[in-house]
């Protein structure tokens, strides 16, 4: 299976060829397609945990109620159907940290 930070190149043979996530994307592994990082600032929230290539950012409300942290998702790096397509506003700012890179390849 494709490990964290990578995704299958061929949906018909998942886990055979795995490529790294594009910049600004993450995959928890297990043959899941890479998805865009959440931008907490854009959502009007604090970043509780920054994104990496294997996990999304975790956001919390600026005045946190007694609820779980919320996450949002942006569009894919390319218009492909296996990734989310919800549009973001045009003024997002990127995370201040760079992701730790997990090598591509098979797990």
């Amino acid at each position: 299976r494709c490990r964290a930070g990578t995704q299958p190149l061929d949906s018909y043979k998942p886990g055979v060829d795995c490529a790294p996530c594009p910049p600004g994307h993450f995959s928890p592994g297990d043959n899941q397609a890479c998805k865009p990082w959440t931008n907490c600032t854009l959502a009007g929230k604090h970043t509780l945990q920054p994104a990496s290539n294997s996990s999304d950012a975790i956001c919390e409300d600026r005045d946190p109620p007694a609820t779980q942290p919320q996450e949002t998702q942006g569009p894919p790096a390319r218009p492909i159907t296996v990734q989310p397509t919800e549009a973001w506003p045009r003024t997002s700012q990127g995370p201040s940290t760079r992701p730790v890179e997990v090598p591509g390849g098979r797990a």
């Epitope: 995704q7 299958p8 190149l9 061929d10 055979v16 060829d17 795995c18 490529a19 790294p20 594009p22 910049p23 600004g24 994307h25 397609a33 890479c34 865009p36 990082w37 959440t38 931008n39 854009l42 994104a51 942006g74 569009p75 894919p76 790096a77 390319r78 218009p79 492909i80 973001w88 045009r90 997002s92 700012q93 990127g94 995370p95 760079r98 992701p99 890179e101 090598p103 591509g104 390849g105």
Partner: antibody
Framework: QVQLVQSGAEVKKPGSSVKVSCKAS????????MHWVRQAPGQGLEWIGG????????TYNQNFKDRVTLTADKSTSTAYMELSSLRSEDTAVYYC??????????????WGQGTTVTVSS | DIQMTQSPSSLSASVGDRVTITCKAS??????VAWYQQKPGKAPKLLIY???TRHTGVPSRFSGSGSGTDFTLTISSLQPEDFATYYC?????????FGGGTKVEIK
């Protein structure tokens, strides 16, 4: 049509910095990752890194990570590459290149015309 | 880093010739290989991705094959506009790396 237009040639002193721009048109800039590749005179291609304009997430070649900064301005559909602590070996043509649109493949389907950066004392 | 070694580094051929360029990866890259054409003073152009899939608008005389560590770009009948330098690229892992190039010259 889809087009990437880069800034003009630069001549820099060793130790200084250079910032190259790449203006995109003909597609939704924020939805495609933008990469930078350089080519020294008479040499092959070397990948520098890439950025996803929608959230600013970036991935760098470790050979450049301490000296390069990639940014993107969605309001002007422009990507930037800044390289610091320049040395003579950085003399090259610098290209911006859009990652292609076919699934998860990290190849480059549209390229800028290139920006020549010359580092000389 | 994954090294991509192309051979030959240059070759001379005539219009109508069948030309074969090879690219060898230093480790298994599955089918995660692209090929580009570059003419003097110009930016590279994508020809092939996923080892054998022609990019939009690329003539059928260009074909790619291979998987694992050995890849081939074939031009079935060389045309005047094909005299250029050709590069392979792997994208199974970061950093993305290119071959050293093969210059196809007129005999």
């Amino acid at each position: 049509q889809v087009q990437l237009v880069q800034s003009g040639a630069e001549v820099k002193k060793p130790g200084s910095s250079v910032k190259v721009s790449c203006k995109a048109s003909g597609y939704t800039f924020k939805d495609y990752t933008m990469h930078w590749v350089r080519q020294a005179p008479g040499q092959g291609l070397e990948w520098i890194g890439g950025i996803y304009p929608n959230n600013g997430g970036s991935t760098y070649n470790q050979n450049f990570k301490d000296r390069v900064t990639l940014t993107a301005d969605k309001s002007t559909s422009t990507a930037y590459m800044e390289l610091s602590s320049l040395r003579s070996e950085d003399t090259a043509v610098y290209y911006c290149a859009r990652m292609g649109y076919h699934g998860p493949h990290l190849d480059f389907d549209v390229w800028g015309q290139g920006t020549t950066v010359t580092v000389s004392s | 880093d994954i090294q991509m070694t192309q051979s030959p580094s240059s070759l001379s051929a005539s219009v109508g010739d069948r030309v074969t360029i090879t690219c060898k990866a230093s480790q298994d890259v599955g089918a995660a290989v692209a090929w580009y054409q570059q003419k003097p003073g110009k930016a590279p152009k994508l020809l092939i991705y996923w080892a054998s899939t022609r990019h939009t608008g690329v003539p059928s005389r260009f074909s790619g094959s291979g998987s694992g560590t050995d890849f081939t770009l074939t031009i079935s009948s060389l045309q005047p506009e094909d005299f250029a330098t050709y590069y392979c690229q792997q994208y199974i892992n970061y950093p993305l790396t290119f071959g050293g190039g093969t210059k196809v010259e007129i005999k």
